[in-house]
Amino acid sequence: MAVTACQGLGFVVSLIGIAGIIAATCMDQWSTQDLYNNPVTAVFNYQGLWRSCVRESSGFTECRGYFTLLGLPAMLQAVRALMIVGIVLGAIGLLVSIFALKCIRIGSMEDSAKANMTLTSGIMFIVSGLCAIAGVSVFANMLVTNFWMSTANMYTGMGGMVQTVQTRYTFGAALFVGWVAGGLTLIGGVMMCIACRGLAPEETNYKAVSYHASGHSVAYKPGGFKASTGFGSNTKNKKIYDGGARTEDEVQSYPSKHDYV
């Protein structure tokens, strides 16, 4: 039951996270005009990954797309790439995880296959979340650098009569959406990986032999590792009730897929 809950919750958290990554990528407010000492402004500038916008206090808003590809800063291109990779990986991860969900039955799919799919989607979610966090962080770093450069040149032409105020940009809402969404996708991915451990059937990767010592009916069995996932060890040391030595295969009853709740 706990495994199903963990897997389901991981899926839902990742779904919310990826929706957030998509939303952040599409949002226009990655950077917004810094309203230093001036909360009311007649012209408010904000920029996204795909277009820049100007909102005039009278109500008119105009957005212009970045119609050039080569003329854009390399950092912006890198952020775009990271966010798109994050979305693509997340989308594939969601698709894989739907089929991996324990509550969904698809033909006679083995639990080992579901475990592998859960692990795959979990890893994809983790990478997707990391891509989003990296993309947003790169953009934020770019903003901080530009902010202090703008501050250093806050006013140009101070020697003359004309004063030109340079527009400074600060963190926009999309950055926070991106960070949170990336974090959620990452957490969801970790939960899927944890759920994978409980999903995998407990198989051994070699035949363990039980020896029957005279006068004792205690079986010795070395701990075998799960063949499919490589996590954990087999701790079910079974007693052998008849005489001679046998292979574990002859006495161990493997769990069926219906034994898991």
């Epitope: 009311v40 402004t41 007649a42 012209v43 820049s52 100007v54 005039e56 206090s57 009278s58 527009t167």
Partner: antibody, heavy 118, light 113 residues
Framework: QVQLQESGPGLVKPSETLSLTCTVS?????????WNWIRQPPGKGLEWIGY???????AYNPSLKSRVTISRDTSKNQFSLKLSSVTAADTAVYYC???????????WGQGTLVTVSS | DIVMTQSPDSLAVSLGERATINCKSS????????????LAWYQQKPGQPPKLLIY???TRESGVPDRFSGSGSGTDFTLTISSLQAEDVAVYYC?????????FGQGTKVEIK
């Protein structure tokens, strides 16, 4: 086409409060515009007093800020100006105007002359 | 506050001749976000409210004759009437809409010589 019409007393005594109303027709006061008050003393230039925008936010000229209040009544499709503690220097033609693209005043009322005199 | 200074204060031009009015701002009116200058030009005839002619320094308002044109960027702007008509006799004002409080120039009176 948006039309604006100012109304209010033409004579106000010094130290009293000047109250004017602008009635908007041909458009909603809640639509994406800003609704401004501008004044022009006789024979002189134009002075922006302040505005209330589509979201109900206000902005005022700092030179008048302590005395000015601009509000709106969406049910009547009107916005109003209150200017307290008036003096003879506040005698002017008061215009209401709509600003939109470029924060420019695209529609104007005909204006109403307010004289401050005892 | 941004101070707007118009020149000349008055201008007498013959019918059909070009009239040029200048406007200078104490601060740049160019917005880096959209590369637009937040300057407007108005025409006011006696006993009437002002009428918008030009916004964003060079965009003509709909219904305004094409003999009116605006130019300039940053702090220096010009309104040009390419061929003055009798109905163009009026006072012309420039207005900055880039930062609060919005301010107007003192006006330029255009007359027929």
């Amino acid at each position: 086409q948006v039309q604006l019409q100012e109304s209010g007393p033409g004579l106000v005594k010094p130290s009293e409060t000047l109250s004017l109303t602008c009635t908007v027709s041909g458009g909603s006061i809640s639509s994406n515009y800003a609704w401004n008050w501008i004044r022009q003393p006789p024979g002189k230039g134009l002075e922006w007093i302040g505005y209330i925008n589509y979201s109900g936010n206000t902005a005022y000229n700092p030179s008048l800020k302590s005395r000015v209040t601009i509000s709106r009544d969406t049910s009547k499709n009107q916005f109003s100006l209150k200017l307290s503690s008036v003096t003879a220097a506040d005698t002017a033609v008061y215009y209401c105007a709509t600003s939109y693209y470029g924060n420019s005043f695209i529609y104007w009322g005909q204006g109403t002359l307010v004289t401050v005199s005892s | 506050d941004i101070v707007m200074t118009q020149s000349p204060d008055s201008l007498a031009v013959s019918l059909g001749e070009r009239a040029t009015i200048n406007c200078k701002s104490s601060q740049s009116l160019l917005n880096s976000g959209n590369q637009k200058n937040y300057l407007a030009w108005y025409q006011q005839k006696p006993g009437q409210p002002p009428k918008l002619l030009i916004y964003w320094a060079s965009t003509r308002e709909s219904g305004v004759p094409d003999r009116f044109s605006g130019s300039g960027s940053g702090t220096d702007f010009t309104l040009t009437i390419s061929s003055l008509q009798a109905e163009d006799v009026a006072v012309y004002y420039c207005q900055q809409a880039y930062s609060f409080p919005w301010t107007f120039g003192q006006g330029t009176k255009v007359e027929i010589k």
